[in-house]
Every structure is written in structure tokens, then in C-alpha cells.
Interface confidence: medium
Amino acid sequence: PEPPTACREKQYLINSQCCSLCQPGQKLVSDCTEFTETECLPCGESEFLDTWNRETHCHQHKYCDPNLGLRVQQKGTSETDTICTCEEGWHCTSEACESCVLHRSCSPGFGVKQIATGVSDTICEPCPVGFFSNVSSAFEKCHPWTSCETKDLVVQQAGTNKTDVVCGPQDRLRA
């Protein structure tokens, strides 16, 4: 018979014959022959291969370097890489999460619209009329101005986006 020119899925062509690929989590140590199957070996403890393959070396698991603010989010297996994320208060600088930066704080006059996660930074928004923020914070939202009326008080000093209103007693008319 004619030697094959293409092989089935999960096979590869070598020396004019189709050999089985190694399954995820295993590396190739020996191609198949006319008499023997492909021989594969499990990846080592800190290694992985995530596809059907004919690789002779497994890939090393990613190292989550604590010096870069990284920690392990999901431990790697023989078939998957380690997933890193950032320590609390930090977030990844890229999708690959190779290093971390401190979460941004929202300045006075701005509040937190969305709290940062391990992969995204803080999103700030300016405090609209009726709201204020007098601190630099990565957690605080804009607070509503105090309602003087509900306390039977009057506004003595108007609020801004950075300060609350100042309430005071109503002026009593003297008899």
C-alpha cells in the first residue's frame, strides 16, 4: 500500500507512517515504528503540556514571583499552566499577569465607581452635584451631602465635590 500523506486527528506523520500523538500531560520519548506504539512520558511535577503533542520537553509551570506582587491563583497541573494573580491591593499590568502595580486611589472630589480586582485597576468617577469625597481612597464611593432639613437644620455652608455641607440652627425671629 501507498504510504500515507496525511494522518487522522491525534496522529502525526513520521517516516511515512502515522503515529499517535501524546495526550495532554505527557511528552514524547519515542516515535512509533512498524512494530511499536508511540511512547510518551508524564510531565514532571512542575511541568505541563496542554495539547495532544509530539513535544520532547514539557513546559515549566509559570512562577508567580512574590517579589513582583504575584501569588498563585490556580496551581498548575500536568495539563494546565499555573495562573497568577496579584496580592491584595495590587493588580496585573497585563492580561498575562507577569507583574503587579498598586491599585490607584481616587483623589478628593472623586469616588470609586468600581473597586479594583486582581486583574483590573480602580475606576474613579467625579462626584456629581449633591455628593462629595474628602479622602484619597481605593474603596470609598462619593457620599451624599448631609440633608440639613431632615435634622431640622439649615445649610450654613454649601457643599462641594470635596466637602460636605455645613448645617446650622435656623435663625429664630426675636419677639
Epitope: 499517535s20 495526550q23 520519548v29 519515542s30 512494530f35 511499536t36 506504539e37 508511540t38 511512547e39 510518551c40 512520558l41
Partner: nanobody, 118 residues
Framework: EVQLLESGGGLVQPGGSLRLSCAAS???????NMWWARQAPGKGLEWVS?????????YYADSVKGRFTISRDNSKNTLYLQMNSLRAEDTAVYYC???????????WGQGTLVTVSS
């Protein structure tokens, strides 16, 4: 008929050494890659070491790396496993085998028991 006959097992103290042998017959030994595998009491079969047909390439499981050495003598149709710095967790039945694929060996011997205990 393919035959693989292991020998050399026994009782040894932690830190001790043993040399296992596997006499092969019924096939062209020098044309095949060979394996050592083991099965600890109550556990599944795990591969220990692999050697290619000429003896020029070897692989070891992480658990035995630096302590065990696989070798072969094609003129004698014999596979060897030198086991040094033995530990209690090395206690198992040791098998030599040929052609392992997808977690199966097509031929393997009857095994030799290694017990590491003080």
C-alpha cells in the same frame, strides 16, 4: 514467546542499595525501549524509569531522580535498575516492561518485591 524475568529484590534498610535485573527473551531486546515500573501496596502502577534501545537516553520519575540508575546490556539481553539511598516509600513490586503507551505496557514480567524497612 516474550518473557521478562525480574530478580534482585529483597529486604533492605533505609539508605541501603539494591540492583534489580530483568532477563529478556522471545524478542529482539536491542530493538526496544525498556521500562521499570512499580506498584506500591494498595496503589496503582507508576513508571520509574525509561531507557531507549541503545542505552543512550534515559528518563526518571521525579521521585527517584538522582537515586536510581537504569542501564542495559544488549549483548546479555538484560535490563538493570541500580537503586541507591532507598526510602520506605520505595517499597513496591518492581516490574520491567516493554512498549508503554497511554498507561499500558504490552509485556511485563511477574515482578520482584523490594521492601525498605528498618
Amino acid at each position: 514467546e516474550v518473557q521478562l524475568l525480574e530478580s534482585g529484590g529483597g529486604l533492605v534498610q533505609p539508605g541501603g542499595s539494591l540492583r534489580l535485573s530483568c532477563a529478556a527473551s522471545g524478542f529482539t531486546f536491542s530493538a526496544y525501549n525498556m521500562w521499570w515500573a512499580r506498584q506500591a501496596p494498595g496503589k496503582g502502577l507508576e513508571w520509574v524509569s525509561w531507557i531507549n534501545s541503545t542505552g543512550s537516553r534515559t528518563y526518571y520519575a521525579d521521585s527517584v531522580k538522582g537515586r536510581f540508575t537504569i542501564s542495559r546490556d544488549n549483548s546479555k539481553n538484560t535490563l538493570y535498575l541500580q537503586m541507591n539511598s532507598l526510602r520506605a516509600e520505595d517499597t513496591a513490586v518492581y516490574y520491567c516492561a516493554k512498549n508503554w503507551h497511554r498507561g499500558r505496557f504490552d509485556y511485563w514480567g511477574q515482578g520482584t518485591l523490594v521492601t525498605v524497612s528498618s
